[in-house]
């Protein structure tokens, strides 16, 4: 009972994950730059995303622009769109092959697979995991590097986005559901023969170090 | 307009020492990195020393890093490089550089000083 | 440190011609570069940076490109204006390091 629990806890979380990394992916506020002209009239927010641009006036109004060459685009956001989408389909890959192991399907009889599917399961979530956070922690990264680069112009600058809280947070959903789905795979084969005992071993689930405290900018 | 005015260049020995000055003007120089990149006779330029505005950060490459040091004086709107154990391949001319909001890199250059190293 | 690799030293063209400077990193610099013109004379001024941003009043015969570690300063129709020494310079990291320069004169 404690290990089906665990099971829906873990593909709970995951999918909790994957809407957050979708969310993430999707959302134009990867970084943030606070624009203020001489003129507070021109006080604006710049969001750029993966996929589009958007300028916020101080009066409230939004306007996007989507990227319009795939090939002009800097190689850095090339790589994390993909590694962005390839993240998505291996955790909806991850989800059908336990949906196929689940205790509550039938799609597979024997116990012993039914605990293998699982376990695959949570290592292809493990995996969508870290492809999260490559691209999350790459952008960080080179806004961290930017805030502490002197010969970087102010208005080059930018903030961590609120899109990368979310692919923190999806990262780390991701790699606690998929462990939790690692480690109930031994107590779901243990009710079937003991030599199936051999064939699995429990492995510590993947830890994520979490972002240390970032610099962000006050604006006055 | 922006001005800056680099003073204090002159002959001096090996091993000894000398301050250069820079006058700014034209702007808010408290809101500005500034830095000072040298130039050696017929060779490329090269990077000396970048402070941050305010003057919390010094950033310096490893060839003056102990023997040079640079300061700002926000009332005077004046910066300085201090230049200890000078040495031959000190001899340059030594252009202040003031940052820029929108662009990267070394924005404004002064016209520069000569410093010459020889006994 | 990052070495920067300029190219050609120097090179002699017609009023009118395109001109093509390039500039290679030992590594990778993402586009953290700028472009100088150093006119005989006279200090330094910042012509591009981050590869391809134009200063305000710098003629748009000037434009920079980057392709992974290479970079391009082109100007597309030689001015005898544009006779002075052009320098790329990296700011990725610490330490910031010049190319050697391109002396560049008018046949």
């Known amino acids: 009972m404690a290990s089906a629990g665990m099971q829906i806890l873990g593909v709970v979380l995951t999918l909790l994950g994957w809407v957050n990394g979708l969310v993430s992916c999707a959302l134009p506020m990867w970084k943030v730059t606070a624009f203020i002209g001489n003129s507070i009239v021109v006080a604006q927010v710049v969001w750029e995303g993966l996929w589009m641009s958007c300028v916020v006036q101080s009066t409230g109004q939004m306007q996007c622009k989507v990227y319009d060459s795939l090939l002009a685009l800097p190689q850095d956001l090339q790589a994390a769109r993909a590694l962005c989408v390839i993240a998505l389909l291996v955790a909806l890959f991850g989800l059908l092959v336990y949906l196929a192991g689940a205790k509550c399907t039938t799609c597979v009889e024997e116990k012993d697979s039914k605990a293998r599917l699982v376990l695959t399961s949570g290592i292809v979530f493990v995996i969508s995991g870290v492809l999260t956070l490559i691209p999350v922690c790459w952008t960080a990264h080179a806004i961290i590097r930017d805030f502490y680069n002197p010969l970087v112009a102010e208005a080059q600058k930018r903030e961590l986005g609120a899109s990368l809280y979310l692919g923190w947070a999806a990262s780390g959903l991701l790699l606690l559901g998929g462990g939790l789905l690692c480690c109930t795979c031994p107590s779901g084969g243990s009710q079937g023969p003991s030599h199936y005992m051999a064939r699995y071993s429990t492995s510590a689930p993947a830890i994520s170090r979490g972002p240390s405290e970032y610099p962000t900018k006050n604006y006055v | 307009e922006v001005q800056l005015v680099e003073s204090g260049g002159g002959l001096v020995k090996p091993g000894g020492s000398l301050r250069l000055s820079c006058a700014a003007s034209g702007f808010t120089f408290e809101d500005y990195t500034m830095s000072w990149v040298r130039q050696a006779p017929g060779k490329r330029l090269e990077w000396v020393v970048t402070?941050?505005?305010?003057?919390?950060?010094?950033y310096y490459p490893d060839s003056v890093k102990g023997r040079f040091t640079i300061s700002r004086d926000e009332a005077k709107n004046s910066l300085y490089l201090q230049m200890n154990s000078l040495r031959a391949e000190d001899t340059a001319v030594y252009y202040c550089i003031r940052g820029d909001y929108r662009y990267d890199a070394f924005a404004y250059w002064g016209q520069g000083t000569l410093v010459t190293v020889s006994s | 440190d990052i070495q920067m690799t300029q190219s050609p030293s120097s090179l002699s063209a017609s009023v009118g011609d395109r001109v093509t400077i390039t500039c290679r990193a030992s590594e990778n610099i993402d586009s953290y570069l700028a472009w100088y013109q150093q006119k005989p004379g006279k200090s330094p001024q910042l012509l591009v940076y981050?590869?391809?941003l134009l200063v305000d009043g710098v003629p748009s015969r000037f434009s920079g490109s980057r392709s992974g570690t290479q970079f391009s300063l082109t100007i597309s129709s030689l001015q005898p204006e544009d006779v002075a020494r052009y320098y790329c310079?990296?700011?990725?990291?610490?330490?910031?390091?010049f190319g050697s320069g391109t002396k560049l004169e008018i046949k």
């Open positions: 310079q990296h700011y990725y990291s610490i330490p910031y390091t």
């Open positions: 981050a590869s391809t």
């Open positions: 402070i941050s505005s305010g003057g919390g950060r010094t």
